[in-house]
């Protein structure tokens, strides 16, 4: 014969555990049955009678299976740097996330605690590291022969175009300048962008003759969050 | 001169540890990343990860997170690479550069062979 | 974890025609999510970085290289080939936090 189904409340089996979606209730020594998402306890089981379960109340939630007394309270309205991805439901906590342009700097269990603007590279360095919703821009000094003269969280360095005479040369900060109408450039128009959100990070030039001059040498990949430093801007 | 020079070919046996490096002058390595790339016989290019001289920050590829750790020493402008828990397949030619995809600073080491041997 | 494609994986041509190399991502657009480069080895020789950005050409690389993307494919296109451009070509795509390189295209004389 199959064994009898055991219906809440129920006391254990020595030894063994409640089944799932039941907790065991210390004081009435049983099994009982747990309040499902967006419930709470408001009536705790005895020997006699189960669990007694009602709905949360406006802006308060449970997210999990429980026998809490009271639902928890959903956390407070989405601050202006940040916008609402998931909302206060009795199921739910609200979660905000930070706005386009803008990275996560403490975050929390769910979401973010405090936003912050993505670094802005300024004029002679580029985005060497893009942005992530929790990290920053890093960013790093022009190479020799490429320049950015725009102060943003999404450029890079670009080379310089390619001159069949050049009326001036191009530093860091500056593309080079043709005389002739029909320069070859090194690349195709137009500014490259990298997608938002963006990193970058500090950045600090070995001394050179002008602030606008491309460090000596060097090539880079992206790196991780750092405070803003000499060639960074904050928002 | 920009020079990216790497330590010599080494020998190993499984189960063990290597630390390569990569002495770099001609720039100021505070200002680019240090990346390392293997390249197994045959194969092609796998990137490993990068470091950031300046404040040794890294990032790895998901396929050796586990297993490597890429610092960099500014007083004396090297880069390092340790490897560990070292398998057959890690057997391959090794190298450091300041290539990055969002630079033009193009420049690379000469290679370091591994060799992963019982 | 993110995988990038190239093909052919050999291509034969001979000096003077056209090579068109394709890398392709597989998450996301390469143009805006992955910042396509492009870097050639030769046998015994340095690496060397070509195309970054998807279109741009790093600083004294010839005209006939050129670079474009569109949707999850990135192309590097060498216009005429010259007997110096026969090696290998690797394409690297950025993921959020690391790079990717592809298998790599081999282009060699016909």
């Known amino acids: 014969l199959p064994a009898q189904v055991a219906f809440t409340p129920y006391a254990p089996e020595p030894g063994s555990t409640c089944r799932l979606r039941e907790y065991y209730d210390q004081t009435a020594q049983m099994c009982c049955s747990k309040c499902s998402p967006g419930q709470h306890a408001k009536v705790f089981c005895t020997k006699t009678s189960d669990t007694v379960c009602d709905s949360c109340e406006d802006s308060t939630y449970t997210q999990l299976w429980n026998w809490v007394p009271e639902c928890l309270s959903c956390g407070s309205r989405c601050s202006s740097d940040q916008v609402e991805t998931q909302a206060c439901t009795r199921e739910q906590n609200r979660i905000c996330t930070c706005r386009p342009g803008w990275y996560c700097a403490l975050s929390k269990q769910e979401g973010c605690r405090l936003c912050a603007p993505l670094r802005k590279c300024r004029p002679g360095f580029g985005v060497a590291r893009p942005g992530t919703e929790t990290s920053d821009v890093v960013c790093k000094p022009c190479a020799p022969g490429t320049f950015s003269n725009t102060t943003s969280s999404t450029d890079i360095c670009r080379p310089h175009q390619i001159c069949n005479v050049v009326a001036i040369p191009g530093n860091a900060s500056m593309d080079a300048v043709c005389t002739s109408t029909s320069p070859t450039r090194s690349m195709a128009p137009g500014a490259v962008h990298l997608p938002q959100p963006v990193s970058t990070r500090s950045q600090h030039t070995q001394p050179t003759p002008e602030p606008s001059t491309a460090p000596s040498t060097s090539f880079l990949l992206p790196m991780g969050p750092s405070p803003p430093a000499e060639g960074s801007t904050g928002d | 001169e920009v020079q990216l020079v790497q330590s010599g070919a080494e020998v190993k046996k499984p189960g063990a540890t290597v630390k390569i490096s990569c002495k770099v002058s001609?720039?100021?390595?505070?200002?680019?990343?240090i990346h390392w790339v293997q390249q197994a016989p045959g194969k092609g290019l796998e990137w490993i990860g990068r470091v950031d001289p300046e404040d040794g920050n890294t990032e790895y590829a998901p396929n050796f997170q586990d297993r490597v750790t890429i610092t960099a020493d500014t007083s004396t402008d090297t880069a390092y690479m340790e490897l560990s828990s070292l398998r057959s397949e890690d057997t391959a030619v090794y190298y450091c550069?300041?290539?990055?995809?969002?630079?033009?600073?193009?420049?690379w080491g000469q290679g370091t062979t591994v060799t992963v041997s019982s | 974890e993110a995988v990038v494609t190239q093909s052919p994986a050999t291509l034969s041509l001979s000096p003077g025609e056209r090579a068109t190399l394709s890398c392709r991502s597989s998450t996301g657009p390469v143009t805006t999510n992955n910042y396509a480069n492009w870097v050639q080895q030769k046998p015994g020789q340095a690496f060397r970085g070509l195309i970054g950005g998807t279109n741009d050409r790093a600083p004294g690389i010839p005209a006939r290289f050129s670079g474009s993307g569109s949707g999850t494919d990135t192309t590097l296109t060498i216009s005429s080939l010259q007997p110096e451009d026969f090696a290998v070509y690797y394409c690297?795509?950025?993921?959020?936090?690391?790079?990717?390189f592809g298998g790599g295209t081999k282009l060699e004389i016909k």
């Open positions: 690297a795509l950025w993921y959020r936090n690391h790079w990717v």
């Open positions: 001609g720039f100021n390595i505070k200002d680019f990343y």
């Open positions: 550069s300041t290539w990055d995809g969002f630079s033009y600073f193009d420049y």
